[in-house]
């Protein structure tokens, strides 16, 4: 019996087609992805093949103005239109709290939404009961397939699930659910989830009875043969893991942002054992036409977005200096504003010993593309912020050793004075440079804000200590020459859309007046 698994993950509100780098589509003839194009391909495969499942491994939420405005209603609407068969909860599905998941998505989805390792307690338990499931048995042709879900247990540090959801260890939670399915004579089981490629592989290895793992969170690109675009494969598709009980378990993921549609064909024997598996992600490029009816629906929904981008978010009573002349040479108040917003967006009081789990932010000055003048009645709009942060990036959470941070700050000024983008703006950090010293030895003082303290204060950076830092995904990926961050980071979790972070902060503060306050000094 043959099953075709079509899968997406980490779509991050890319409902419209995008450029090759998943930013805003500029030249339509070269654009990719989007739900209208995805629907064309899915329908083509459904017509050609008998047993097809369309699955999503989480993080539909967060990433463009679509999510900012529609808050998840767009996800439910278009996933329903594409007739997804199941979805796993990702960490970003909790970005607007549990209510922001229940109302727009859980109550509206016409497909099961899954996670076996999230347990509700207290008053939430009855409110959310049955709205998401640990597993769902689906009819596929004349057979049945069990889909069991899982979600990153780091979600409380990455999003806003509140205090009434407990995120258990994935493997511990999955095994009894898979055992239950086996007891119920369901012999073809897919683990669908959002914990990253390393955990996907562990699940394939450790959870007895799982036949296939469809993952997300780490934006992993797998491919067999010559890759069709810029993404470099982390391994073959499918990636085969030998389980502890000796089975060959295919593990797949389909990069991110709806650029590819994962396509995996599995052959099962009559006892539900995987005989063979093969496939590849399908690049959703312009050779695949956008479905006209879905496209028309997108255009209808788009109207509200255009109206939103010119509405006032808040006011500034000071000039927001985002000029290259400032932000690439010294502390600039636009950099301070953005870093303060980044920290504020990551406030998670999950431990009595810590006032917060993260206190530091770094931001490449070259990523700040425009100032905002306060003399326009102080008004700040989404449109203004899109000029400051035009690249559609995310502000991510990483863990780095102090020694890596020190290298990053040396890199920040290694060729100071040439208006280059690597000059770092900061939050929760006090740095002093001596430019008379040779490159690589110019950081004379580097103090960081404590987290394990009741009264936050600045202490010298310790080289061997591990620190959490919020930074743009551009830097986490080694951009602007920050190769040491990419090479030495100990953990990397994708965060929220950059403009969304700053806009939310401005809306919350209502009136802002960021200052230049001595975060960066020269001796």
């Amino acid at each position: 019996w043959e099953l075709t698994i079509l899968h997406t993950n980490d779509v991050h509100s890319r409902l419209e087609q995008t450029s090759e780098d998943s930013s805003k589509c500029v030249n339509a003839s070269r654009c990719m992805g989007g739900v209208a194009r995805l629907f064309t391909k899915v329908q083509q495969i459904r017509r050609a093949e008998p047993n097809v499942l369309l699955l999503d491994a989480g993080d539909q939420y967060q990433g463009t103005i679509w999510f900012t405005v529609y808050k998840g209603a767009e996800v439910a609407h278009f996933m329903n239109a594409l007739r997804y068969d199941a979805m796993a909860l990702g960490n970003h599905e909790f970005d607007n709290g549990v209510e922001g998941l229940i109302e727009p998505l859980l109550k509206e989805a016409k497909f099961p939404i899954l996670s076996a390792n999230i347990k509700a307690k207290g008053p939430l338990a009855s409110q959310i009961s049955g709205l998401y499931l640990p597993y769902k048995v689906l009819p596929v042709g004349d057979e049945v397939v069990g889909i069991v879900g899982y979600t990153s247990k780091e979600t409380p540090f990455l999003s806003n699930p509140g205090t009434n959801l407990v995120f258990e260890d994935e493997i511990t939670a999955l095994q009894p659910e898979v055992d239950k399915l086996k007891t119920l004579n369901v012999n073809k089981i897919i683990a669908l989830g959002h914990s990253g490629f390393e955990m996907d592989k562990l699940i394939a290895q450790k959870v007895r009875g799982v036949d296939v793992v469809v993952g997300g969170h780490s934006n992993t690109f797998l491919y067999t043969g010559n890759p069709p675009s810029k993404e470099v494969p982390a391994g073959k598709y499918p990636f085969i893991v030998t389980s502890d009980d000796g089975r060959k378990v295919p593990v797949v993921q389909a990069y991110a942002f709806g650029k590819y549609l994962g396509y995996l064909k599995i052959e099962f024997d009559e006892r539900g054992n995987v005989i063979s598996s093969h496939g590849n992600p399908i690049l959703l490029n312009s050779s695949i036409p956008e479905d006209p009816s879905i496209k028309a629906d997108i255009n209808k929904w788009r109207i509200k977005l255009d109206n939103y981008s010119t509405q006032e978010l808040g006011k500034t009573i000071v000039y927001l200096d985002g000029s290259s002349q400032s932000c690439r040479f010294r502390e600039c108040n636009m950099g301070n504003l953005i870093c303060d917003a980044m920290i504020n967006n990551n406030l998670r009081h999950t431990d009595e010993m810590f006032w917060n789990h993260v206190s530091m932010c770094i931001l490449n000055g070259g990523g700040i593309r425009s100032p905002i003048d306060e003399r326009n009645n102080g008004t700040i709009t989404w449109e203004n912020l899109a000029a400051v942060l035009p690249f559609g990036g995310t502000f991510d959470l990483v863990q780095l050793k102090g020694s890596t941070l020190k290298k990053a700050f040396e890199h920040s000024v290694h060729r100071y004075g040439q208006s280059t983008g690597e000059f770092l703006q900061v939050g929760g950090i006090h740095v002093v440079y001596d430019l008379s010293r040779k490159p690589g030895d110019r950081v004379v003082k580097l103090d960081v804000l404590c987290t394990k303290c009741r009264v936050p204060s600045y202490d010298p950076l310790k080289m061997d200590e591990v620190y959490k830092v919020i930074l743009p995904n551009f830097l986490a990926n080694g951009g602007d020459g920050f190769q040491m961050i990419k090479d030495e980071l100990l953990r990397h979790d994708s965060g929220d859309q950059d403009i969304n972070v700053v806009s939310t902060y401005i809306s919350k503060m209502k009136v802002i007046y960021p200052a230049v306050e001595g975060r960066i000094k020269f001796s």
Epitope: L133, Y135, L184, N185
Partner: nanobody
């Protein structure tokens, strides 16, 4: 081989009663949410009543509330639908369906999600 077999259908006069049975072979109904659905000629299939395996919670469509009763006998691996005060508009093919997923009885009956196991159906005709 897993099977759901419905029985008890037939011709009945308006105001009369029938009891439908759904017998399962190949799986234990204790662990399943069970539903009765019906499809009248030219109409969509609709959920009539559902019952859970765990806490025996039930759900009824508004159109049958107070007239129909769902019950289960786990020792016989059978679910019943007692139908009373039957009307002409109750005429339909009645199907039994089962889902081992932990869905609510309401989600099962709507049905919110695809249901994996179905019987072949039994015809109920209400006519004088």
């Amino acid at each position: 081989q897993r099977q759901l077999v419905e029985s008890g259908g037939g011709l009945v006069q308006p105001g009369g009663s029938l009891r439908l049975s759904c017998a399962a072979s190949g799986f234990l109904l204790d662990y399943y949410v069970i539903g009765w659905f019906r499809q009248a000629p030219g109409k969509e299939r609709e959920g009539v009543s559902c019952i859970s395996g765990s806490d025996r919670s039930t759900y009824y469509a508004d159109s049958v509330k107070g007239r129909f009763t769902i019950s289960r006998d786990n020792s016989k691996n059978t679910v019943y639908l007692q139908m009373g005060s039957l009307r002409a508009e109750d005429t339909a093919v009645y199907y039994c369906a089962a889902d081992p997923s932990p869905v609510t009885v309401q989600a099962m009956c709507l049905p919110r999600f695809p249901v994996p196991y179905w019987g072949q159906g039994t015809l109920v005709t209400v006519s004088s």
